[in-house]
Interface confidence: low
Amino acid sequence: AGHLEQPQISSTKTLSKTARLECVVSGITISATSVYWYRERPGEVIQFLVSISYDGTVRKESGIPSGKFEVDRIPETSTSTLTIHNVEKQDIATYYCALWEAQQELGKKIKVFGPGTKLIITDKQLDADVSPKPTIFLPSIAETKLQKAGTYLCLLEKFFPDVIKIHWQEKKSNTILGSQEGNTMKTNDTYMKFSWLTVPEKSLDKEHRCIVRHENNKNGVDQEIIFPPIKTDVITMDPKDNCSKDANDTLLLQLTNTSA
Amino acid sequence: AIELVPEHQTVPVSIGVPATLRCSMKGEAIGNYYINWYRKTQGNTMTFIYREKDIYGPGFKDNFQGDIDIAKNLAVLKILAPSERDEGSYYCACDTLGMGGEYTDKLIFGKGTRVTVEPRSQPHTKPSVFVMKNGTNVACLVKEFYPKDIRINLVSSKKITEFDPAIVISPSGKYNAVKLGKYEDSNSVTCSVQHDNKTVHSTDFEVKTDSTDHVKPKETENTKQPSKSCHKPKAIVHTEKVNMMSLTV
C-alpha cells in the first residue's frame, strides 16, 4: 500500500521567496504512480493544483497561473517536490500531496493524502532560536496515591511558527499513546502549547517520551523530551496537610536546559 | 461547474449516539461521479473514510456507513457510534476515475463539516484537582468532571501570566482540563475549581511524604526537570547539556 510522508509540517517564508515542499512516497514505486498536489487556503475548499504522472507528464489545474507552481519527482529518493515561486499572501495554505492507491479488489482505488505542509508567510525578524522550549511536569504525589495513575505534562514554549505536532511513547516502544492537548496559544511573537499523558500506576516506573515535531527543531529532527520513571510505593496520606507550606519538607530542584 | 455543499458547517454529536452527515451536489447528477469522504483531524491529517462501491479506509468499516441518495442528489455518511476519536472536519469529494469516457482523476472537494463530540448526558461528577509545578510554571490538572462548565482559579498573589484552560473529553467520556500559569511564588500556588455550584481545592487532595524516594530521575536531554514541592529527590541529578541549576531548600 502506498504511504505519503511530508517531512516539513510547516515552511516559513518571506514574501517573494521560493518555497519547496517535499513529499516522500513509500510502499509503491514513485515512477509507477501519479502524485497529485492539493492546497487548502484558510476558509476555502481543498483544491487540486498540479500533478505529475508516472510518465513525467505534468498537469495543472485550469486557472492556476503559469510559472507559479512547479512539480517534479526524484525517483532515487522517491520524492515529489512542489515548488512555489514568488510566494505572496494568497499562497498561505496547507499543501497536501496525494496518490491513488489500489485496494485489494481489482478496480477499487482510493486516494490517500500526505499529512500536509502549512506554508506560512512572515516578515517578522524573530530570534535565531524559535524551536519549542520544553518544560516537564511530573505527576503530583496526590494523583499517584489517590488515583493509582499519574499525569505527565509537556509544556512547549517560545516557538514559531505555530504548527507543531506532539505525541507520546514509552521509552522502548513505538506505540503512540493516547494523550490530550491544549490549543496552541500566542504569546507575544511566539507560541506555546502543552500536552499531557495520564498513565496507570503500573506504567509509572517506565520512562516516557514526549516527541515534538516542529519546523525549527535543531537539525530538523523530532525533539524527544524524556520523562523519568516515578516510584510510587513510599507515600502516606495526610489529607489535612498542605505540604507546599511545609518548608522543611520541600526540596526544589530545577534543571533548565539553556544550551544552544 | 459542480459544487459539493455540506448540509451543515458544524455538527455536534454525542458519544455513542448515531449521527448523519449529508453533502449535496449542485450543477450535476451525483450518479455521474464517485463520492468519497475524508476526515481531517488535529494536525491536518487527511484520512480516507469511504468511497462509493463499498470501499472503506482501514478501521472505518465497522463504525461508518456511506450511501448515495440519487433522488435527492446527495451523499450520506453515517457515524454509527461516535467516540471522541471521531472529532474533526469531514469532507465529501467526488471524482470520475474508472467510469469510462471522459474522466477526471482529481478530487473536487466540498467545504468541511466540523464534527464536535460531546459526552453523553450523564450524572454530574465532581472533579479531582491536582497541582503540578516546575520553577515558576504551575499546572492545575482537573480530572473526570461532568458537566463541562467549570472555572479554574490558580490562587496566587504574584501572577506573571495565565493561559486559558484546555478542556477536553476524557477517555471515560467525562471532561478533563488543564490550566497553566507562571507565578513568582509558585511554591505557594494552589488551585481552586468552581463546578456545579461547588468549590473544590487542590489542597483537598494533597498528601504527605514519609520518604525521600518518590522521583527517580534518569539522565535526560533537552528538558527542564521539575521543581516539585513535596518531593525530595535523593540526589542532585547530573544531567548532560544542563548548565543552570537552582536549589531551594
Partner: antibody, heavy 124, light 112 residues
Framework: EVQLVQSGAEVKKPGSSVKVSCKAS????????ISWVRQAPGQGLEWMGG????????DYAQKFQGRVTITADKSTSTAYMELSGLRSEDTAVYYC?????????????????WGQGTTVTVSS | DIVMTQTPLSSPVTLGQPASISCRSS???????????LSWLQQRPGQPPRLLIY???NRFSGVPDRFSGSGAGTDFTLKINRVEAEDVGVYYC?????????FGGGTKVEIK
C-alpha cells in the same frame, strides 16, 4: 469568509459616551488585531487604536488616550470601542477593521476586512 | 506622530488614461525589521475603505493589476495605469511602521 458587523447608528448628547460593537464571524477571533478608525464628515481617516483579543491589552493613539476604551469579548467574538466625553467634533463614521484569514495573525497593520461603519452623531 | 502628506488633493482623469498619486512621510517608513509598512486604500463613495496595496507594492488579493505601488523610504506612489469608472473614489496612503497608525489626507480621483 471573514465578516465584521457593526452596531447601528447612534445620536448622542455632548458629554455623554457611546459604545460601538463589532462582531467578527467566519474565523478565529482571538489572534487577529482589530483596529478602530473614524472618519468625520467629508474628512479623512483617523486611527484611534486597536486590540488583539488574545492579549486583551489595547493600543491607543495618544490623541484619544483617556477618552477611548477598546475591549474584546472572546466568548462572543465581539470587539467594542467606547468613546466618552463626546463633543460635536466626534460626529463621524466609526469603522472597525482587521486582517483577513489569509493574513498571518501578527499583521497588526493590515486592514483587509472592514465593518460597514457606525454613524455617531453628537448634537445637543 | 508620522505625518503622511498626499498630493494632489484631487485628480480629474479621462477614462482609460493613467493616474498617479504621491504620498510623502515625515520620516522614513523603514521598520527595524527591514520592511516598509506603507499601504494604499481605496474608498468609493458611501463605502468603507478597501485595501489595495500593502508593503509599498504588494497587490492585495482580488485587486486588478492596473493598480501598482512603488517607492521607498519617505516617497511613495500609487499608479492606476488605465482608469475605469469603478475607480472613482478617494485614495489614502497609510503607514503602520510606527504607532499610531496614520493616514494621508486622501486624493479624490474623479472622471473629467
Amino acid at each position: 469568509e471573514v465578516q465584521l458587523v457593526q452596531s447601528g447608528a447612534e445620536v448622542k448628547k455632548p458629554g455623554s459616551s457611546v459604545k460601538v460593537s463589532c462582531k467578527a464571524s467566519g474565523d478565529t477571533f482571538n489572534n487577529y488585531a482589530i483596529s478602530w478608525v473614524r472618519q468625520a464628515p467629508g474628512q479623512g481617516l483617523e486611527w484611534m487604536g486597536g486590540i488583539i483579543p488574545f492579549f486583551g491589552t489595547p493600543d491607543y493613539a495618544q490623541k484619544f488616550q483617556g477618552r477611548v476604551t477598546i475591549t474584546a469579548d472572546k466568548s462572543t467574538s465581539t470587539a467594542y470601542m467606547e468613546l466618552s466625553g463626546l463633543r460635536s467634533e466626534d460626529t463621524a463614521v466609526y469603522y472597525c477593521a482587521r486582517p483577513g484569514s489569509g493574513s498571518p495573525d501578527y499583521y497588526y497593520y493590515d486592514m483587509d476586512v472592514w465593518g460597514q461603519g457606525t454613524t455617531v452623531t453628537v448634537s445637543s | 506622530d508620522i505625518v503622511m502628506t498626499q498630493t494632489p488633493l484631487s485628480s480629474p482623469v479621462t477614462l482609460g488614461q493613467p493616474a498617479s498619486i504621491s504620498c510623502r512621510s515625515s520620516q522614513s517608513l523603514v521598520h527595524s525589521d527591514g520592511n516598509t509598512y506603507l499601504s494604499w486604500l481605496q474608498q468609493r463613495p458611501g463605502q468603507p475603505p478597501r485595501l489595495l496595496i500593502y508593503k509599498i507594492s504588494n497587490r492585495f488579493s482580488g485587486v486588478p493589476d492596473r493598480f501598482s505601488g512603488s517607492g521607498a523610504g519617505t516617497d511613495f506612489t500609487l499608479k492606476i495605469n488605465r482608469v475605469e469608472a469603478e475607480d472613482v473614489g478617494v485614495y489614502y496612503c497609510m503607514q503602520a511602521t510606527q504607532f499610531p497608525l496614520t493616514f494621508g489626507g486622501g486624493t479624490k480621483v474623479e472622471i473629467k
